[in-house]
């Protein structure tokens, strides 16, 4: 659910880390209407999360602590 | 111990609604999904849908949206799963599990089951 | 949705026999997988998460293997309470898929 690069809504899908390889953050105040987690899948596939939801909390901080360890 | 205790048995009528229970204790309710399974007589088993207890967060299989509702009620720890305009098909034990991202998305604990009977 | 295909869906054994059922996903799941055992009456249980870690409590004769869409449960030496029926589960992404299921009999 993008466009323009700006996600419009969030996937009704849960996620497995082991399919994320990355994510970046869209925020409301820099050009998007909502705030994302924007995942990106080892299938080249980038899907909108909403930033609230535990499951989209969880991943971000693992993706966050390997970004740290490396 | 982690136990998570499903209510009993039902028979219902065709086009009614049944609510199951599950109430879970031995660990913060809050910190874990609950997932919901179906398992129709001498068949295999069948992802429902799953809730968030911390938020009510819910995801279902597209199978099941319409028919099954889970919500939770925190200040009891307890989850229910209703589902409604009952049919002969949906004759099944139906399951409550815990989620666990700790340990790889399991189902780590399994309500003892609830069987639900459709019919007229 | 991602399909999970188990092979076989019955298989007689004896005990003291090494036996492996396998699960083939419709698409790489990178090892987003785990196996259930279920007894007749009674609740799954929990066997392998992550296609290839032994759940708490679970013997080590169990163990699981595989990658991308092709995974594995191997029990190297049945013993008599390992008759049961045994499910593997996608978890990549919902809805989560369980396969068929395999039963394993004494024969």
């Known amino acids: 659910a993008s466009n323009f690069d700006c996600c419009l809504g969030y996937t009704d899908r849960i996620l497995h880390p082991k399919f994320i390889v990355g994510f970046t953050r869209q925020l409301a105040n820099e050009g998007c209407d909502i705030n994302a987690i924007i995942f990106h899948t080892k299938k080249k596939l980038s899907v909108c999360a909403n930033p609230k939801q535990t499951w989209v909390k969880y991943i971000v901080r693992l993706l966050s602590k390997k970004v740290k360890n490396m | 111990q982690v136990q998570l205790v499903q209510s009993g048995a039902e028979v219902k009528k065709p086009g009614a609604s049944v609510k199951v229970s599950c109430k879970a204790s031995g660990y913060t309710f809050t910190n874990y999904w609950m997932h919901w399974v179906r398992q129709a007589p001498g068949q295999g088993l069948e992802w429902m849908g799953v809730?968030?207890?911390?938020?009510?967060?819910?995801t279902y299989n597209q199978k099941f949206k319409g028919k099954a509702t889970l919500t939770v009620d925190t200040s009891t720890s307890t989850a229910y799963m209703e589902l409604s305009s009952l049919r002969s098909e949906d004759t099944a034990v139906y399951y409550c599990t815990r989620g666990n991202y700790g340990v790889d998305y399991a189902m780590d604990y399994w309500g003892q089951g609830t069987l639900v009977t459709v019919s007229s | 949705d991602i399909q999970m295909t188990q092979s076989p869906s019955s298989l007689s054994a004896s005990v003291g026999d090494r036996v492996t059922i396998t699960c083939r996903a419709s698409e790489n799941i990178y090892g987003a997988l785990n196996w259930y055992q279920q007894k007749p009456g009674k609740a799954p249980k929990l066997l392998i998460y992550?296609?290839?870690n032994l759940a708490d409590g679970v013997p080590s004769r169990f163990s699981g293997s595989g990658s991308g869409r092709q995974y594995s449960l191997t029990i190297s030496s049945l013993q008599p309470e390992d008759f049961a029926t045994y499910y593997c589960q996608n978890v990549l992404i919902t809805p989560y898929t369980f396969g068929g299921g395999t039963k394993l009999e004494i024969k």
């Open positions: 992550g296609a290839t």
């Open positions: 809730i968030d207890p911390s938020d009510s967060y819910t």
